[in-house]
């Protein structure tokens, strides 16, 4: 009977634990004529056998560390041995058992750390390997600090990333480590397999010696620079220093200014490159960055503050060529006529911008001089001596000196004497009746003309009319513009009308003068008018609560996860149906009723974030009007891309024979997101057999050096496998191959006889 252990020839996969003696057959393949026998090929390693009748079995225990997957092929043959079915792939996956202990790559590690280094920033990696499967607990390593010597006040200054072996400072270590007090520390580190969670885990230990060095990468004190300096530029204003020589310094202008007047040299000295103008910009904040030779930041940037000190380089300025005020002829002594407000661009609340006001001339001097006074510091003009008479002098001109501590400016004021305001505005109609408008009437439309008259002196503040809506328009949908020549009021639409919230509005207007009424006169009913605004319904499209909806999720969320939601309302109260538009990647679906948005496929930050789609809200029924809004899905990175080589390294070569051990540098990258400090890869040889010939050493977080251990290489191509671990969560590892050719050289290039020009290496080492 066909079942779990027998059946026709087809691709199959079997999983078998390593280390177990064979206890049963793997599978019995059944032959269909003309097939009479079976043949097994591929990675049999003389362990896997198929009998002529199709019985597939293995004859001794498997070892995952020798081969984790056996790729076999089974073919059915006829009586002549000709393949009549297949070959089909048969995959044997060897399941891991914990039969290997972790071992540190070194029995002793040495490293150094700067005082005040950022907590959590690795300065040293310990690295252990376990031949067991890293995808199972058997090969999942757990690093721990067993002891720190010396231990001061029972405080740990060092911490280790349990998964990656990255050693960094704790917050206390960052604050308290001081080479003057204690220049060296020793750590004993243990590594356990089984993720550290089992009593049956294997372990190993190593010793780490750490030197503490002084940190001089510190932000300098804020700098003050006087504006408009006449000294020769550039002028050194401050400095920064990286802890070691050879750093490459640069300044970063976060504000993206059109002109950035600072520079830094390769000593770390910071200069101002041209005179500053406080009135243009009174302070600068920028950053000093130190990078290594590969352009990677060595540490966090330092914030540089430059304050520009004011000098009195701006005179006072008048608010306008002539400032005009009005005064009624019966006004009392001491009444305010108006305030002259001059300006000074120098720094506020300093002597450089503190202004004094003084009347230097009055014309005409009738009936006498000194009719007006000005408050020295406030600039307020007052009536000083007596009431004025328009028929005697209808206009006065004052020259006023405005001064700061160094500069003087003359400003001109014209004072018009006007008739007393003893007449109120009177509407020609008290009721402007009813007006019916559709709710989609254009903004800016004039919907009504109103008119009041005032018998006071024409073209003065006493007769000028200002119209206000004092009732019936709390939303401010309407406004009134006044024609200054005719005092006609034009009622205009300032905001959209809305049938749903205000179908009928009872509007009340008030007409007022800008000048105060004389004592005893008051506005009465004649200065008020009304009208009724009736708004008719227009079917409107749904309205989204936001123009853009934003949500943020991790790129590895499970399919079916709610990732956001949108809301819209229909002004007429109809139900709304939601849909998506422009979901080019097919990642999302929207609940038509609730507006909730769900993932329907795996998301991928590396394909592009934010992912932008449009959401459409459509009326259900009615005229099916719709509106569109944006939904932006910001994808947060997870470590889902293994490291790889940053570029194509075909064509690396050494000239044969080697006169001395050689080395070459390569760079790794991955497609995940890296914060300011960039990736932190660790590098090791891909298999133990390579260690006799090669060694790999880390240069920084992205670069490593591959070196030969001797000079006795054959004249051929070697493929060096390198394991690159990204130390992420979870850590991902890539195995990459660097093809290195040893070849005869002519003038530093690989020599190939004519006719053998394919694949000439192009990079000599």
């Amino acid at each position: 009977q066909e079942g779990k252990f027998s059946g026709p020839l087809k691709p199959m996969t079997f999983s078998i634990y390593e280390g177990q003696e064979p206890s049963q057959i793997i599978f019995q393949f059944k032959a269909n004529p003309p097939a009479v026998t079976f043949e097994l090929t591929g990675e049999t390693d003389n362990i896997f056998v198929i009998e002529r009748e199709g019985l597939l079995y293995y004859n001794r225990a498997l070892d995952r560390e020798t081969r984790s997957t056996h790729n076999l092929q089974v073919a059915a043959l006829d009586a002549n041995g000709i393949i009549v079915e297949g070959p089909v792939p048969i995959t044997i996956k060897v399941k891991d058992i914990n039969d290997n202990r972790p071992t540190f790559l070194q029995s002793k590690y040495e490293g150094s750390v700067r005082q005040n280094s950022r907590p959590g920033k690795p300065f040293l990696y310990v690295n252990a390997t376990d031949l067991d499967d890293p995808a199972t607990p058997n090969g999942q390593l757990y690093y721990q600090i067993v002891i720190q010597l010396p231990m001061i006040n029972n405080v740990m200054y060092f911490q280790i990333n349990n998964k990656t072996g990255a050693i960094s400072l704790t917050r206390e270590g960052s604050q308290e480590l001081n080479p003057a007090k204690n220049p060296s520390y020793n750590l004993v580190i243990s590594v356990k397999d089984m993720g550290g969670q089992s009593e049956n885990s294997f372990s190993d230990t190593t010793s780490v010696d750490i030197i503490v060095t002084e940190n001089i990468w510190k932000a300098p004190k804020p700098v003050e620079m006087v504006e408009n300096s006449t000294d020769p530029h550039p002028i050194k204003i401050t400095q920064v220093r990286w802890n070691d020589p050879g750093a490459q310094y640069s300044l970063v202008d976060k504000e993206k200014l059109p002109r950035f007047p600072f520079s830094i040299d390769q000593e770390g000295d910071i200069y101002v490159t041209q005179p500053l103008d406080r009135e243009e910009k009174d302070a600068y904040v920028f950053y000093a960055v130190a990078k290594d030779e590969y352009g990677k930041p060595l540490s966090y940037p330092l914030e540089i503050h430059v304050k520009v000190k004011d000098i009195n380089d701006n005179p006072p300025t008048c608010p306008s060529p002539v400032t005009v005020f009005e005064v009624q002829e019966n006004e009392r002594l001491g009444n305010s006529i108006g305030t002259l407000t001059a300006h000074d661009r120098d720094e506020e609340n300093t002597a450089n911008s503190f202004l004094n006001y003084r009347i230097v001339e009055q014309t005409p001097k009738l009936p006498m001089d000194g009719l007006f006074l000005i408050q020295t510091y406030a600039g307020m003009l007052q009536l000083a001596k007596q009431s004025l008479k328009k028929q005697d002098t209808p206009q006065y001109n004052l020259t006023i000196e405005v001064s700061d501590k160094d500069f003087k400016t003359l400003c001109f004021v014209q004072i018009n004497v006007i008739d007393i305001n003893d007449q109120i505005p009177i509407f020609e109609k008290s009721d402007y009746g009813n007006l019916t408008l559709a709710e989609d009437t254009n903004i800016g439309s004039t919907i009504l003309t109103i008119q009041a008259t005032d018998a006071d002196e024409p073209f003065t503040g006493s007769s000028k009319i200002l119209y206000h809506i004092i009732k019936g328009d709390s939303e401010g949908r309407l406004g009134v513009d006044t024609d200054p020549h005719t005092n006609t009021g034009y009622v205009i639409i300032k905001k959209p009308l809305d049938f749903e919230t205000a179908a009928v509005s009872n509007i009340v207007f008030k007409a007022e003068n800008p000048e105060p009424l004389v004592f005893g006169v008051k506005y009465n009913a004649s200065s008020f008018a009304k009208f009724t605004l009736i708004v008719t319904d227009v079917n409107e499209a749904p309205q989204f609560s936001q123009h853009v909806f934003q949500a943020k999720v991790s790129e590895d969320v499970a399919i079916g996860t709610k990732v956001g939601n949108v809301t819209a309302k229909d002004p007429e109260g109809l139900d709304i149906s939601y849909s998506l538009r422009g979901d080019t990647r097919g990642w999302l679906k929207i609940d038509h009723v609730t507006g909730e948005i769900f993932s329907v496929a795996p998301l991928d930050r590396e394909a592009g974030s934010p992912y932008r789609v449009q959401v459409v809200a459509t009326e259900v029924g009615g005229s099916s009007l719709s509106s569109v809004s944006e939904f932006h899905l910001i994808l947060m990175d997870v470590n889902d891309n293994p490291p790889r080589l940053a570029k194509d390294y075909t064509g690396l070569f050494f000239c044969h024979p080697l006169s001395a051990p050689g080395s070459l540098i390569f760079e790794a990258t991955d497609d995940d997101q890296h914060l300011f400090r960039g990736p932190h890869f660790t590098f090791s040889l891909g298999s133990g057999s390579l260690q006799n010939d090669w060694e790999v050493s880390k240069i920084n977080g992205t670069h490593a050096r591959l070196s030969t251990r001797h000079t006795e290489f054959e004249e051929r191509e070697y493929v060096v496998l390198i394991r690159i671990n990204d130390g992420g969560r979870p850590p991902l590892e890539g195995i990459v191959s660097l093809p290195v050719t040893f070849c005869s050289c002519v003038e530093g290039s690989c020599f190939r006889p004519a006719g053998h020009q394919t694949g000439i290496p192009t990079v000599g080492m």
């Epitope: 004529p33 003309p34 009479v36 002549n80 000709i82």
Partner: antibody, heavy 118, light 108 residues
Amino acid sequence: QVQLVQSGAEVKKPGASVKVSCKASGYTFTSYTMHWVRQAPGQGLEWMGYIDPKSDYNYYNQKFKDRVTMTRDTSISTAYMELSRLRSDDTAVYYCARGFFKGYFDVWGQGTTVTVSS
Amino acid sequence: EIVLTQSPGTLSLSPGERATLSCSVSSSISSSNLHWYQQKPGQSPRPWIYGTSNLASGVPDRFSGSGSGTSYTLTISRLEPEDFAVYYCQQWTSYPFTFGQGTKLEIK
């Protein structure tokens, strides 16, 4: 010793049929396939097909598919090849040959001359 | 079907000389599936070399075979009088099994 003995020469008219026999001895008849190969006068060798005596499964060269029949009688360890609707260009020496698994024709009969002539 | 082309059609050499016979295959085959047969006038073919390079029983060691993919060779290092015959190559990879047209080795 292993040998294959074929029937004697035949003279046939066009349109007739001929049946050639091949008796095996010195080995287990059902353990090897039996093939038929012909050779026209002054020409090369041409494979006609085979029979698996164990299962009676046969496979014929497309060229002869409609005219050839290969059979066997395991009780007397004999294989037969019958060619029908003979034409003058079927004049040839017909050989039986033992097929060695995943191998080659390791034993050949002495050949049977078939002459087709009106 | 797989076509085998032998060259030369006729090879005229004297005893003691070296002979090289070629067999070109229309598509690549495994070397274990290329065989050579010797036939003398009035006789049945005899297996001579199997699997490209293995000598059949009774074949003198002055014969050798080589090749891979689509190109195969039968070589006789020093011709003896009894070596003059027709040699056929044959493939055992897929149906129909096919032979080369033969190379006739004759005395010069």
